[in-house]
């Protein structure tokens, strides 16, 4: 899977959208790596 910063950001945005934003506060692009997915 793509692990560039932009890919990680878009993947996280999709995850946040699907979860209704109910995730930990520190679950932000600069805190998670591609392995988080």
């Amino acid at each position: 899977a793509c692990d560039t910063a932009t890919c990680v950001t878009h993947r996280l945005a999709g995850l946040l959208s699907r979860s209704g934003g109910v995730v930990k506060n520190n679950f932000v692009p600069t805190n998670v790596g591609s392995k988080a997915f």
Partner: antibody, heavy 119, light 107 residues
């Protein structure tokens, strides 16, 4: 309102260095990567690199490795791009850009900083 | 580096026309492609990410498609404010790379 506000135009001599700033507001600066892109007159956009303001990790386009340095000042929510050993081909508009998720999912760009390299 | 080849480099069209711009990657980039609009003297404006998703506020007449190596940006009914230069970008691999641009001019 998310804003990326860049420093003003610069005129430099060949061999000199330039440092462009990008002041972020309206979001949590350390949560999102900052990209730097340039555009020489009449040319395509060219990616310089990105920086993680949280841990200051960087990725550089090899074309600029060793000449470009990306840094941040977390306390001032400001990103910097320094380019050294300037040559005439570095004359371009330099942009900072960041994809933000909160408060609004969008790819925000600074207004651009014109750097002119001329003897 | 991945090369992004855009075509055409320029085109002339009229208000109301359907416009299609293509972008070909030199290797597989999955759907990790973005499209930007740029007007003279202005910063690029993001339109599309992940090949086919519109950012909020981008008019529905803009649509993107494609995966792998072949991508398309379509403007279904060209409006006066759409005359600009459009760029594709791949962000699947470092360094991110952009296409050469397509200038959409008034016929």
């Amino acid at each position: 309102e998310v804003q990326l506000v860049q420093s003003g135009a610069e005129v430099k001599k060949p061999g000199a260095s330039v440092k462009v700033s990008c002041k972020a507001s309206g979001y949590t600066f350390t949560d999102y990567y900052m990209n730097w892109v340039r555009q020489a007159p009449g040319q395509r956009l060219e990616w310089i690199g990105d920086i993680n303001p949280n841990n200051v990790g960087t990725n550089y386009n090899q074309k600029f490795k060793g000449r470009a340095t990306l840094t941040v000042d977390k306390s001032a929510s400001t990103a910097y791009m320094e380019l050294s050993s300037l040559r005439s081909e570095d004359t371009a508009v330099y942009y900072c850009a960041s994809i933000i998720i909160v408060p609004n999912y969008f790819d925000y760009w600074g207004q651009g900083t014109t750097v002119t390299v001329s003897s | 580096d991945i090369q992004m080849t855009q075509s055409p480099s320029s085109l002339s069209a009229s208000v109301g026309d359907r416009v299609t711009i293509t972008c070909k990657a030199s290797q597989n980039v999955d759907t990790n492609v973005a499209w930007f609009q740029q007007k003279p003297g202005k910063a690029p404006k993001s339109l599309i990410y992940s090949a086919s998703y519109r950012y909020s506020g981008v008019p529905s007449r803009f649509s993107g498609s494609g995966s792998g190596t072949d991508f398309t940006l379509t403007i279904s009914s060209l409006q006066p404010e759409d005359f600009a230069t459009y760029y594709c970008q791949q962000y699947n691999n470092y360094p991110y790379t952009f296409g050469g641009g397509t200038k959409v001019e008034i016929k």
